[in-house]
Interface confidence: low
Amino acid sequence: ASVGLPSVSLDLPRLSIQKDILTIKANTTLQITCRGQRDLDWLWPNNQSGSEQRVEVTECSDGLFCKTLTIPKVIGNDTGAYKCFYRETDLASVIYVYVQDYRSPFIASVSDQHGVVYITENKNKTVVIPCLGSISNLNVSLCARYPEKRFVPDGNRISWDSKKGFTIPSYMISYAGMVFCEAKINDESYQSIMYIVVVVGYRIYDVVLSPSHGIELSVGEKLVLNCTARTELNVGIDFNWEYPSSKHQHKKLVNRDLKTQSGSEMKKFLSTLTIDGVTRSDQGLYTCAASSGLMTKKNSTFVRVHEKPFVAFGSGMESLVEATVGERVRIPAKYLGYPPPEIKWYKNGIPLESNHTIKAGHVLTIMEVSERDTGNYTVILTNPISKEKQSHVVSLVVYVPPQIGEKSLISPVDSYQYGTTQTLTCTVYAIPPPHHIHWYWQLEEECANEPSQAVSVTNPYPCEEWRSVEDFQGGNKIEVNKNQFALIEGKNKTVSTLVIQAANVSALYKCEAVNKVGRGERVISFHVTRGPEITLQPDMQPTEQESVSLWCTADRSTFENLTWYKLGPQPLPIHVGELPTPVCKNLDTLWKLNATMFSNSTNDILIMELKNASLQDQGDYVCLAQDRKTKKRHCVVRQLTVLERVAPTITGNLENQTTSIGESIEVSCTASGNPPPQIMWFKDNETLVEDSGIVLKDGNRNLTIRRVRKEDEGLYTCQACSVLGCAKVEAFFIIEGAQEKTNLE
């Protein structure tokens, strides 16, 4: 197409030789005339500039827009395309001229002593060795060395074209150091120039940007982006960057090769883009493309440019976190900001440091949350540049599934005397408090193991049918009291009690407490016996070093073979939801004890004495009696608790006080200890004696001084003593005012 003029107005230049191909002999003269409709120019082989001395281009004598090209004594190297064209257009006429020079059948380029061919080892690629011919129909082969190999055209992938050269798959000659073309004419061999073979790679393994993501800056900061291309050996790389503000004044690009370890099968190239002071217009996508000619790989990253440093909380930041005891708690500090803020966590105002139980970083992690972790956690974000602070409070509430206190305290196998009224208790600790505590029951015989069955510790009662206590038909008459709330060991607990009006039937009772995070249950074996009865002499709960006797009384006409046992440790612990094994069915866990037998008119009494009871004597004691007729064993279990000896302590302080004459003073002195201590009062180190005005009550715990007089002023001491020592507290009572004189007549 013509440039600047409509193409329809111009015909192609007309050549005097109307052929596509012209073959002439060497040493003859080549002359071609070209006529057209505008200014014309010629181009010919080996000299595109028109400065060749041998070639002559002249204006025709017979007309405008006509030029003749003349080459006297042509040689093989004059072979090629001769083009006549209109200036400044693409309109041209071409003739290809072969100058047959049998002494020099290959066209040599003017300057080359040897050529270079670049190849890749790609199986699908072919390479052209540019050994052009001055004769069109030569018989040409390609020689490669070393070792010497010859390749001949095969009509398929190996071919020779006089205008193009020798074409061959590149991998076939990748071993060679050099190649050349050879033509046979009348048994003479003619060689082209040598071509050095250079194997170039093309594979790019990857292109990596660093930083790869999350790049944030504020206006005026420096951006440095590194683009690394990893390639196979013998690869050259061109880098090309695309970025938002191409006209940037302060942009700098540096490309360099990186050294790799010797023997490495890989090359590395690095391109670094630097913008010294970014502006908002530099925000956007940055793309680095690495090209090896045959392959291009690229990678991109987004650069965010902020107007100025800032910090703010993200809207996913929790204000309330709820967890259950034992869980791992994660509270992430969700923020928006640049640069990333410094993060500091506080609990109830105290800084948190990381340790094996807690990690205080971008995410506050509590490995195994417990009740004491409940509280307010403050996270403070500080922008490291502007020092701007943002704070946020997260309330952590730790929930506790119901735990039933008596499970670990009371024997799971207590026995109860027929006809008695009994109270069963479940003390539940849970956060939040249980939304219900339900009681269930079932008959013992429906659940107890048959003698033939092996006792399974994990499921000793093969029964599932628990009945609501409202349905007490066939069982004991029951009443469930309203739940009470009590502060026990500093914890708010819910106490549920079930009253059995008359113990007539052996049964199992289960209390089940449920709150929002779980459930807890306790199974009570309520074994009713008409048989033996256990009593403790002299006290239900002896203190260590005191003596205690356990009495087992049984009707002599009904029972025989009274024996005392102590229940040993369970062979396996009883897990939540499992039922205790009936004690008479499993004597393996019992230790037989020495005891003394007494009798009266109706009963046998088996007495087991513990002299100087110790804490090791605590546990479950079993009295076993055998029915004289049926030989069935009856067991009664009593849990013995031995109280630890504790030296006296006085809780609370006596306060110094000032009182006016005629008023009253009331003070309290509460002492604890085991055995319980005796309380004594002293005034000015002398024993305080009760009289009409001085009253001691509640085992001397409370002291009242009525209508105080000036002489009641002084140092008062409360002293609590037991065999384990004494404790005392003191206070000074000041009496103000003048003593009234009274007349005694």
């Epitope: 107007e307 909380f313 993200g314 809207s315």
Partner: antibody
Framework: CQSLEESGGDLVKPGTSLTLTCTAS?????????MYWVRQAPGKGLEWIGC???????TYYTSWAKDRFTISKPSSTTVTLQMTSLTAADTATYFC????????????WGPGTLVTVSS | AVVLTQTTSSVSADVGGTVTIKCQAS??????LAWYQQKPGQPPKLLIY???DLASGVPSRFSGSGFGTEFTLTISDLECADAATYHC??????????????FGGGTEVVVK
């Protein structure tokens, strides 16, 4: 092609309850997503109701929505808005929208579903 | 809680002209602001986020600016198709979930 569609809009009487469902097509919710409910009374502006953090399951509500509106995620492609004690003031087109991670602008919206509360 | 105010409820301009819509925040919200376009019977469509970043597929005729409390949406070379209501939305969060999704009241653009 990723899209959201709300359903469940209806004419209901004051004091009743209604549940709207937002169904995702062409994608499943991922931990990076937050799903939102926004409403628009006829001729009025947009009003943010609340959202659910798909990653943690945490829900967030605007102050007036706390007591009567509940957002939940029954499946990996549905989010619901449960509304109770409806009044005429709740008459609006209800949209569900999605944001991906931070920050919380809404990149995908459903076409909306109309809820009319009238006796 | 952040309150966004779009003082102008309606603005009109000629085809080919330029229109500017303002949005004011009751407190510093940095650049945490988005703009949406809403046509009748359709859901809103995100135009701008981070106060000035163009959402994908949005023509460069739309631009956003501002930081802190004052924000502006500019539409140049106005086309008929730009007739719609434009809403601003803050996604700044200062500690109460009620802050999370404040919207402005909306500004209607009428193209003559």
């Amino acid at each position: 092609c990723q899209s959201l569609e709300e359903s469940g809009g209806d004419l209901v009487k004051p004091g009743t309850s209604l549940t709207l469902t937002c169904t995702a097509s062409g994608f499943s919710f991922s931990a990076r997503h937050f799903m939102y409910w926004v409403r628009q009374a006829p001729g009025k502006g947009l009003e943010w109701i609340g959202c659910i953090d798909i990653g943690s399951g945490s829900t967030y509500y605007t102050s007036w929505a706390k007591d009567r509106f509940t957002i939940s995620k029954p499946s990996s492609t549905t989010v619901t808005l449960q509304m109770t004690s409806l009044t005429a003031a709740d008459t609006a087109t209800y949209f569900c929208a999605r944001s991906s991670g931070y920050p919380y602008y809404f990149t995908l919206w459903g076409p909306g579903t109309l809820v009319t509360v009238s006796s | 809680a952040v309150v966004l105010t779009q003082t102008t409820s309606s603005v009109s301009a000629d085809v080919g002209g330029t229109v500017t819509i303002k949005c004011q925040a009751s407190e510093n919200i940095y650049s945490l602001l988005a703009w949406y376009q809403q046509k009748p019977g359709q859901p809103p469509k995100l135009l701008i986020y981070s106060a000035s970043d163009l959402a994908s597929g949005v023509p460069s005729r739309f631009s956003g600016s501002g930081f802190g409390t004052e924000f502006t949406l500019t539409i140049s070379d106005l086309e008929c198709a730009d007739a719609a209501t434009y809403h601003c939305q803050s996604y700044y969060y200062s500690g109460s979930s009620a802050d999370t999704g404040a919207f402005g009241g909306g500004t209607e653009v009428v193209v003559k």
